[in-house]
Structures are given as C-alpha cells and as structure tokens.
Amino acid sequence: EPPTACREKQYLINSQCCSLCQPGQKLVSDCTEFTETECLPCGESEFLDTWNRETHCHQHKYCDPNLGLRVQQKGTSETDTICTCEEGWHCTSEACESCVLHRSCSPGFGVKQIATGVSDTICEPCPVGFFSNVSSAFEKCHPWTSCETKDLVVQQAGTNKTDVVCGPQDRLR
C-alpha cells in the first residue's frame, strides 16, 4: 500500500517517501524503489538553510559597499550572509538591502537613543531645564547651568536651544 504521508524530513513523490536533503545540500535526484535521494553540497557563495528538495541553492546576499553595506557575518553553506551598514549609517529595512545616514537631532532636541547598524537615531524634545544648541546624532539634551552653585544669578533665561546666562549678583551699595 503506497504511503499518503511521510515522516519528518521526508517528502512524498511517485508514491514513495524520499529523504529530504539536509541544510547545505541540494537535490540531484529523487529516490526510487532502488536508490536513495541523491543530494549535493551547495557551491561556494551558495546556501540552503532548511531540509529541502530544492534543485538549486540560493546565492549568498551581496553586501554592496556602494549602498553603504558591509558584511556583518559571512554566509556558510547553511546560512545566508548578514549585511550591516558602515559607521554612521543604518539599514532601511529588516532585510538590510540598503543604508541611509543616521538622522541628527536638531537644536532643541537631544538624542534619546543612539543609532545602530539597524535602527535610526531617536530624538526627543529637550524638556524644561534642558537644552541642545547643536544638530547632532550623539548629543543628549544638556541640563541648564546652575548659576546658584557658582554663586551667580541668572541673567538670561535658558530655552530648549540655549543655556541660561549667569552673571554676578548685584552688590548692595
């Protein structure tokens, strides 16, 4: 009685349960009553990452330097190459097919989370008591200077873009 379903790591073909090819190998020929499934290792720069019956291996991803990409992890016969972006750039998608320059936080905004190879800079508005006077991908909001601790007084109030200006206390004459 020919099978209608096969065990794990097998597939049904011509009423036969044939072994799938292991990761890193491709199918050359299906099994028959007289022969096993024939598999061959993937070539250089190729991979297959599952038990399979593919007749062609997949090409490793190319990390194109023209798109700001570089190799984070070299591919094997069983895994694809993993790309990441050059310093100062991040991936535009999860697949990391291209890169864009990290965003800078404008004056009045500080860096909440520094960008990585896969995520952009996250900016936040500087709250009261904090400022940022530069456009930067690294600078956080800085606290206003405390004039009191320097025995000075506030001569000009701070904003989200500027620090306070301290001056000497008026002396009683």
């Epitope: 020929s29 028959t32 009553e33 007289f34 096993e36």
Partner: antibody, heavy 112, light 112 residues
Framework: QVQLQQPGADLVKPGASVKMSCKAS????????ITWVKQRPGQGLEWIGD????????KYNEKFKSKATLTVDTSSSTAYMQLTRLSSEDSAVYYC?????WGQGTTLTVSS | DVLMTQSPLSLPVSLGDQASISCRSS???????????LEWYLQKPGESPKLLIY???NRFSGVPDRFSGSGSGTDFTLKISRVEAEDLGVYYC?????????FGGGTKLEIK
C-alpha cells in the same frame, strides 16, 4: 510499457573505442538511474556504473573508471557508454538497466 | 568493496520442491538512511536478468508469490516454495547500498 533497446552486437579492433547506446521508452527517462553491467561469456555480472539522466550525476565502479564513460542525451531518451582502449578482456555482453527492467544487451567482440 | 558470497554454487532440485539460496555480504549493507538495497535476479540462458525481489523482501510486480526474500544486515535468503520448470536458471543477489555496487557469483538452479 518500459523498454530499453540496445543494438545486438558490435565488432571492434583492439585499441579502438566504442560507444554503445541504450534507448529508453515507456517512462520519463529523467526519473530513474540507468545502470550498466558487464557479463563475460559464461561468467557472472559486474556493475560498471550508473548515470542519472535528469542531473547527469554518475557513480562508477573504480575498476571501470578509466575504461567507461557514461553519458545521456535526454532529447533522444538515449543513454550511452563509451569504452576506450579496447582489448580482448572487454569482449562481453553489456547490459543497460533501470534495475526493474533490463535491455537485451549488446555483445561486444574485440578482435583483429 | 562489499563481497557478496552466494551458496550453493549449484542447486539441483525436483520440480515442486522448495529451494533456498543464501547470499552473505562481507559487511553490513544497511546504508546511512537505514535502507537495505538488496535485490535478487534470475537469468535464464540467452536472456537478460529479470528482477524478482528488491529491498530484501519486496516482490517485483508480476513475480509469482512462490518467490520470497528475507534477511538483514549481512545474511539474506531467497526461497522458492514450489519450483517450476520456468524457474530454472542462474540466480544473482545484488547490493546497491554501498558503492561500488556488487553482485553475488550466482547460483545455478537445475533439475535433479
């Protein structure tokens, strides 16, 4: 029905080469390996090698690796075995088979 | 290489008798997938071999049920429950589990 057709006989001179044919019909050629077997007069059977017509993949008996070359022409559904540098030791019946079905065999005579 | 040893070399029987042919391999012929590709063939005089049994126990289509195969590892047996005149000829065992694939030397079934 499945058939493997082979020419009946071939006579060649020592030192020459011969290319034997095996025409398959009645099934999809690319699904089964083709096996080649040698039988000397009054002797037993000897496995030469196998070829998979779908992929061109081959397996050889080390003993025949420098003697036999297996090929396939899928367009004509024909498998071939070329034998080189022939001597009287190569005089035999050569069968092609799908294992469940066999050709009638080609009788090769090597003689000057 | 796996040596396939058949016994007896010659087996004289009376029609209607049971016949038993043994085939021993020089090493275990279970392959890496857990399968044993052991086949039995019958070759009548002037004919090509015909498949009787494959994968140790499976009767090929059209083969009478008086033929049965058994065994495992290194010991295999072909039994013919009631020998008929058409069963006479040379029987070969063949292993296709480990390359190079190899035939036994043959057992001649003849009338006593």
């Amino acid at each position: 029905q499945v058939q493997l057709q082979q020419p009946g006989a071939d006579l060649v001179k020592p030192g020459a080469s011969v290319k034997m044919s095996c025409k398959a019909s009645g099934y999809i050629l690319t699904t089964y390996w083709i096996t080649w077997v040698k039988q000397r007069p009054g002797q037993g059977l000897e496995w030469i090698g196998d070829i998979h017509p779908g992929s061109g993949s081959t397996k050889y008996n080390e003993k025949f690796k420098s003697k036999a070359t297996l090929t396939v022409d899928t367009s004509s559904s024909t498998a071939y075995m070329q034998l080189t540098r022939l001597s009287s030791e190569d005089s035999a019946v050569y069968y092609c088979a799908r294992r469940d079905y066999w050709g009638q065999g080609t009788t090769l005579t090597v003689s000057s | 290489d796996v040596l396939m040893t058949q016994s007896p070399l010659s087996l004289p029987v009376s029609l209607g008798d049971q016949a038993s042919i043994s085939c021993r391999s020089s090493q275990n012929i279970v392959n890496s997938q857990g399968n044993t590709y052991l086949e039995w063939y019958l070759q009548k005089p002037g004919e090509s071999p015909k498949l009787l049994i494959y994968k140790v126990t499976n009767r090929f289509s059209g083969v009478p049920d008086r033929f049965s195969g058994s065994g495992s590892g290194t010991d295999f047996t072909l039994k013919i429950s009631r020998v008929e005149a058409e069963d006479l000829g040379v029987y070969y065992c063949f292993q296709a589990s480990l390359v190079p694939w190899t035939f036994g030397g043959g057992t001649k079934l003849e009338i006593k």
